[in-house]
């Protein structure tokens, strides 16, 4: 089988706080050296990119500057943290995995693991 | 409006060069990885070249590697397939095509012709 | 490399009839990997399924995917006059990315 199978948890609970973490891990066909990691949104049947990083393995997974995201790797196993999530930003989050180099190229795809986000009740006011 | 525009297609004789330009339109060139696909007249597709989001990872098919070279300039949101020793079994209709965040070629441009005859 | 072969080469079925379409891998493609497109004469593919069952934008509902491991069909429950044409089926999970030899429906 050419497929390349990546798998992530179902579900996971952000924290208060608005981060949600979670592991992707893929079952590499080959001797990727150069990897891409990708965080994709779906809702409804639109799907958006949230963050990437493309690392070469045995290094550090790095995101750019501003993402919400950052990362890091073991292997053929990545985890993954997206912070400043709110209740709006509930949904389904999937890891897609490319193994860019050296030859072939592989895609895989995980089922998504949908992230529950609750916002904060605010603070009651204090008579102190 | 979301597009892909190829151009610089034409006639061409067995052993010339030709470089095909493939411009893109209202999404973020850079986050997508782009294909060349091709369509001999009266026949099916065939893809011809992959590359990555910055350009540095590059596939071809094996019946046009070592003679065609695609590249990405992300500044000028552009892509380009330049064909050298061009045969008449290159001719063909030749599409730029955008990879889906899914993998799928969701985005196509319209197509440019390429005919390679003495 | 992943051979696709379609069949049949030609179909021929009168409007408002079903149409099946097979498309067999020479090994296992990943559901998540196989993709239809539709190309009409003079006119660039057009994407209809992706990951073997989920219809890409604007499709309507009367195409329908299904399959997984080396056997896919792309189903046209009630042909409409546009949709004569000719359907590929591609793998996009592993290079070379590679189509079938593409199937005609044509009006009966």
């Known amino acids: 089988c050419k497929a390349m199978h990546v798998a992530q948890p179902a579900v996971v609970l952000a924290s208060s706080r608005g981060i949600a973490s979670f592991v992707c891990e893929y079952a590499s066909p080959g001797k990727a050296t150069e990897v891409r990691v990708t965080v994709l949104r779906q809702a409804d049947s639109q799907v958006t990119e949230v963050c990437a990083a493309t690392y070469m393995m045995g290094n550090e997974l790095t995101f750019l500057d501003d993402s919400i995201c950052t990362g890091t790797s073991s292997g053929n196993q990545v985890n993954l943290t997206i912070q400043g999530l709110r209740a709006m930003d509930t949904g389904l989050y999937i890891c897609k995995v490319e193994l860019m180099y050296p030859p072939p190229y592989y895609l895989g795809i995980g089922n998504g693991t949908q992230i529950y986000v609750i916002d904060p009740e605010p603070c009651p006011d204090s008579d102190f | 409006e979301v597009q892909l525009v190829e151009s610089g297609g034409g006639l061409v004789k067995p052993g010339g060069s030709l470089r095909l330009s493939c411009a893109a339109s209202g999404f973020t060139f850079s986050s997508y990885t782009m294909h060349w696909v091709r369509q001999a007249p009266g026949k099916g597709l065939e893809w011809v070249s992959f590359i990555s989001y910055d350009g540095n990872t590059k596939y071809y098919a094996d019946s046009v590697k070592g003679r065609f070279t695609i590249s990405r300039d992300n500044a000028k949101n552009s892509l380009y397939l330049q064909m050298n020793s061009l045969r008449a079994e290159d001719t063909a209709v030749y599409y730029c095509?955008?990879?889906?965040?899914?993998?799928?070629?969701?985005?196509w441009g319209q197509g440019t012709m390429v005919t390679v005859s003495s | 490399e992943i051979v696709l072969t379609q069949s049949p080469g030609t179909l021929s079925v009168s409007p408002g009839e079903r149409a099946t379409l097979s498309c067999r891998a020479s090994?296992?493609?990943?559901?998540?990997?196989l993709a239809w497109y539709q190309q009409k004469p003079g006119q660039a593919p057009r994407l209809l399924i992706y990951?073997?069952?989920s219809r890409a934008t604007g499709i309507p509902d009367r195409f329908s995917g299904s399959g997984s491991g080396t056997d896919f069909t792309l189903t046209i429950s009630r042909l409409e006059p546009e949709d004569f044409a000719v359907y590929y089926c591609?793998?996009?999970?592993?290079?070379?990315?590679?189509f079938g030899q593409g199937t005609k429906v044509e009006i009966k």
């Open positions: 090994q296992s493609v990943g559901s998540s990997y």
């Open positions: 990951g073997a069952f």
């Open positions: 591609q793998q996009y999970g592993s290079s070379p990315w590679t």
């Open positions: 095509a955008r990879t889906s965040l899914l993998g799928p070629f969701d985005l």
